[in-house]
Interface confidence: medium
């Protein structure tokens, strides 16, 4: 049986059940290389509390559909008196990056995971030429996830004192040059994740090969190398390589740009101080508030919730968007879709789509940006579930009793963007983390 998601095959992936202190290793095409789980384990569970290993999915006992991968075992388990076998179930959803498998829950018999990934899309519009895993767990099993930094088009400019060259990078995947409105990035060779531009020429100085690595819990490293044997004439016989070190800052701060810290014989060392390098629980919440010592800040958007069936309305040219954030109030127009953001076509109000659901909510504060994300909406033709990204700005004089109102700023590939000026986005900072 052919591997269902070939682009995920090259790596062993990790997921964590934080509540029970369990680390899972997953290899969806072969077996994980862990002796204690046996030679054919596709999903190996490491219980750090008891220091034991169990195979909870066998690579030989795999069954697959386009959106579900199941690995059975021959190990019996007792679930309400019936004689089942231990198994792992991975539900796949279309995403814009390779993404990460997320542990959902585990019963006596079944270990459930969910994975939003380009590999599960119906169309190839989000697929990279080359992409590597962009997250890592530290020794305390805390997740550091750089997926939000991945650019689907364009690149980051590296801050460099050399006026004659510009070094552009992407994170964990190659630079998509096709959407560049000018010639600056178009000259970059396909597959490059680090592109050096000199005048009208562009050179590949690194492609992604290995996934993100953790050096210390506040430092992550990504390495790009130029694979082909052909040397560049200005590299003195050396093969180009780029090392990006992502540093979690010691306290809350605005984002910085990637900076070139060393350059010798086409070996480029880049340091990027960004809160995305910090563990995810420092940046994100599933509720509408971020507070406590863990996050160093106090943010509470719950006063923005609307009651009594009313919603915020945002005008988007062909569509009206109805928003009801930070609550579980049904939007009247949205046909019991559990939508936090509802898209209604102006010319045909029967065309209603959920652009993100209220139980699929993430609040993130990173690098000075406060963002509320609703995902899991109705599918687009690519298979990607509509989502909404609301970028908040602090405005102490916002109208509507300080609440302000969301403004639609655009749509890209079924992701809807809004900005929202409100006094409730004014962040209160605490002490160091």
């Amino acid at each position: 049986q052919a591997a269902p998601f070939p682009e995920l095959c090259s790596y062993t992936w990790e997921a964590v059940d934080t509540k029970n202190n369990v680390l899972y290793k997953i290899n969806i095409c072969g077996s994980v290389d862990i002796v204690q789980c046996g030679p054919s384990s596709a999903v190996c569970m490491h219980d750090l509390k008891t220091r034991t290993y169990h195979s909870v999915g066998d690579s030989v006992l795999r069954s697959a559909t386009r959106s579900l991968l199941e690995f059975n075992t021959t190990v019996s388990c007792d679930q309400q008196g019936t004689n089942h076998r231990v198994q792992s179930s991975i539900a796949f959803l279309c995403g814009k990056t390779l993404g990460t498998p997320e542990f959902v829950t585990a019963t006596e018999c079944v270990h459930y995971f969910e994975w939003r990934t380009t590999a599960a899309c119906k169309k190839d519009i989000f697929k990279a030429n080359k992409e590597v895993p962009c997250y890592v767990f530290d020794e305390e099993l805390r997740k550091h996830d750089l997926n939000p930094l991945i650019k689907l088009s364009g690149a980051y400019l590296v801050d460099d004192s050399d006026p004659d060259t510009s070094l552009f990078i992407n994170v964990c995947r190659d630079i998509d040059t096709l959407r560049d409105p000018g010639s600056q990035l178009r000259a970059c060779p396909p597959g490059t994740a680090a592109c050096l531009v000199r005048g009208h020429q562009a050179f590949d100085v690194g492609q992604p090969r290995d996934g993100l690595k953790v050096v210390r819990k506040d430092r992550l490293v990504l390495s790009y190398v130029r694979e082909e044997a052909g040397k560049l004439d200005f590299c003195d016989g050396h093969s180009p390589a780029v090392t990006i070190t992502f540093v979690c800052p010691s306290e809350r701060r605005e984002g910085t740009i990637p900076k070139l810290t060393a350059k010798s014989n086409c070996r480029y060392e880049i340091e990027w101080i960004t809160e995305y390098a910090c563990h995810r629980d420092y940046l994100e919440s599933k509720t509408c508030s971020l507070s406590g010592e863990q996050q160093d800040v106090s943010i509470d958007l719950t006063p923005l919730a609307q009651s009594g069936g009313s919603s915020y309305i945002s005008d988007g040219k062909e569509y009206l968007f109805y928003l009801n954030v930070c609550g579980e109030t049904e939007i009247q127009f949205c046909n019991k879709k559990q939508a936090a953001v509802c898209q209604v076509k102006k010319s045909d109000t029967s065309q209603v789509k959920a652009a993100g659901r209220y139980h699929n909510q993430t609040l993130r504060y990173s690098d000075g940006f406060l963002t509320l994300i609703y995902f899991g909406g109705d599918e687009c033709s690519s298979g990607f579930q509509r989502m909404s990204v609301i970028n908040f700005e602090c405005n102490k004089t916002a109208g509507n009793d300080g609440k302000g109102t969301p403004v639609f700023t655009g749509e890209v590939d079924c992701t809807y963007f809004f900005t929202w000026d409100t006094e409730y986005a004014c962040v209160h900072h605490h002490h160091h983390h």
Partner: nanobody
Amino acid sequence: DVQLVESGGGLVQPGGSLRLSCAASGRTFNTYNWGWFRQAPGKEREFVAAIRWSSSKTSYADSVKGRFTISRDNAKNTIYLQMNSLRPEDTAVYYCAASIVDFTTNPSHFGSWGQGTLVTVSS
């Protein structure tokens, strides 16, 4: 590619105000970062202001901070530059530009340009 057309330039007295507009058509308006640049006679093109497409984050050249404001109307695919307290040294051709490179004020990283609109500040 994106096509950009600037308007709103003209002659204004020192201390006066002007509002420049830049209408975009062609490829999706919402994937780019937007900038205003200017070029005075005999000088290099210089950065004035920029706005990120996915949020309201803006940046300004030190020489215009507090006097100029960049903004955007996504429904009209238009960006604006509100210029207050104009000075003779603001006299230049003002250009609107689009880029998909983040964190840049370098004109060479902006791929699409308008034809420019002349602003003259003189008594």
